[in-house]
């Protein structure tokens, strides 16, 4: 039975040109995390495999940095980066857990800075 839950930063906002950390955390399960996939809509951003390390999709390689941890740092944000992001945890023996983050990239400097994992 899958007992785990994914905690995410939920809805976050950041300024155009800035950076943001996308972070999820799997709790309430003893399952082993074998891999985390980061996706935006139907596009793969990155994969962090516990043994093989990181895969960064070529279309994002100049703007995505691995980490911290299993998270993903998105840099040089544009308004087009606004949207849903998914962390997909592959675990053994539970299976797959999915978390959702909504990122809004704001034009002005009045972006909220309250997000827990946001880079100053």
């Amino acid at each position: 039975m899958m007992t785990g839950t994914i905690e995410t930063t939920g809805n976050i906002s950041a300024e155009k040109g800035g950076s943001i950390i996308l972070q999820c955390h799997l709790s309430s399960t003893t399952a082993q995390v074998t891999q985390v996939n980061w996706e935006q809509q139907d596009q793969l951003l990155a994969i962090c495999n516990a043994d093989l390390g990181w895969h960064i999709s070529p279309s994002f390689k100049d703007r995505v940095a691995p980490g911290p941890g299993l998270g993903l740092t998105l840099q040089s944000l544009t308004v087009n980066d606004t949207g849903e992001y998914f962390c997909i945890y592959h675990t053994y023996p539970d299976g797959t857990y999915t978390g959702r983050i909504f990122l809004e990239v704001l034009e002005s400097s009045v972006a909220e800075h309250g997000a827990r994992f946001q880079i100053p």
């Epitope: 596009q43 793969l44 994969i47 043994d51 093989l52 390390g53 895969h55 279309s59 592959h90």
Partner: antibody
Framework: EVQLVQSGAEVKKPGSSVKVSCKAS????????IHWVRQAPGQGLEWMGG????????IYNQIFRGRVTITADKSTSTAYMELSSLRSEDTAVYYC????????????WGQGTTVTVSS | DIQMTQSPSSLSASVGDRVTITCRAS??????VVWYQQKPGKAPKLLIY???YRFTGVPSRFSGSGSGTDFTLTISSLQPEDFATYYC?????????FGGGTKVEIK
């Protein structure tokens, strides 16, 4: 120039083990994962597992159920794949391949090692 | 495990023909797909990754596309050196799996 040079052909008895080596050159060994892929005669490709020399992480295809062991000697930039409890169905060409940096794509391959399992 | 199904398993074509090979994943693999070319008695060679980026030195006549579960490798104008077997592979989740291959033969 990146090169992966594998050990020579082997003929083994059923129930025995084989250890294939893959010597890497032309790049920093610890910066790239090494994978092992096999191909039975006239068949397709089958991923066996990989080894990350950066932090000694090893991952296996569970279809081999503990029969495969992947190791490396970083001092000689050599990766090894050992397959135990051999059976006739393990007759195949075994390839090592390097993964590109920050990409799960195998960009350079060894020449292959033919392993024949026969009584 | 994710199954990768290639079609056709073989095809006959002439030099100059446009050739299309398809690969279907049994479940969502986003764009985590790679294509390899293999000639008889030789190791596979990386052609395309992610799934539309050509590897270094790969001619522009090779192109890849797709996302989700359906992927395509296209050779815009087949050359004599392109007669080979082509494999797709997914790396969305382990174990990594390959398609059964498509053999491109001379008509």
């Amino acid at each position: 120039e990146v090169q992966l040079v594998q050990s020579g052909a082997e003929v083994k008895k059923p129930g025995s083990s084989v250890k294939v080596s893959c010597k890497a050159s032309g790049y920093t060994f610890t910066e790239h994962v090494i994978h092992w892929v096999r191909q039975a005669p006239g068949q397709g490709l089958e991923w066996m597992g990989g080894f990350n020399p950066n932090h000694d992480g090893t991952i296996y295809n569970q279809i081999f159920r503990g029969r495969v062991t992947i190791t490396a000697d970083k001092s000689t930039s050599t990766a090894y794949m050992e397959l135990s409890s051999l059976r006739s169905e393990d007759t195949a060409v075994y390839y090592c391949a390097r993964a590109a940096k920050l990409l799960f794509a195998m960009d350079y391959w060894g020449q292959g090692t033919t392993v024949t399992v026969s009584s | 495990d994710i199954q990768m199904t290639q079609s056709p398993s073989s095809l006959s074509a002439s030099v100059g023909d446009r050739v299309t090979i398809t690969c279907r994943a049994s479940q969502h693999v986003s764009n985590a797909v790679v294509w390899y070319q293999q000639k008889p008695g030789k190791a596979p060679k990386l052609l395309i990754y992610s799934p539309s980026y050509r590897f270094t030195g790969v001619p522009s006549r090779f192109s890849g596309s797709g996302s989700g579960t359906d992927f395509t490798l296209t050779i815009s104008s087949l050359q004599p050196e392109d007669f080979a077997t082509y494999y797709c592979q997914q790396h969305y989740s382990t174990p990594w799996t390959f398609g059964g291959g498509t053999k491109v033969e001379i008509k």
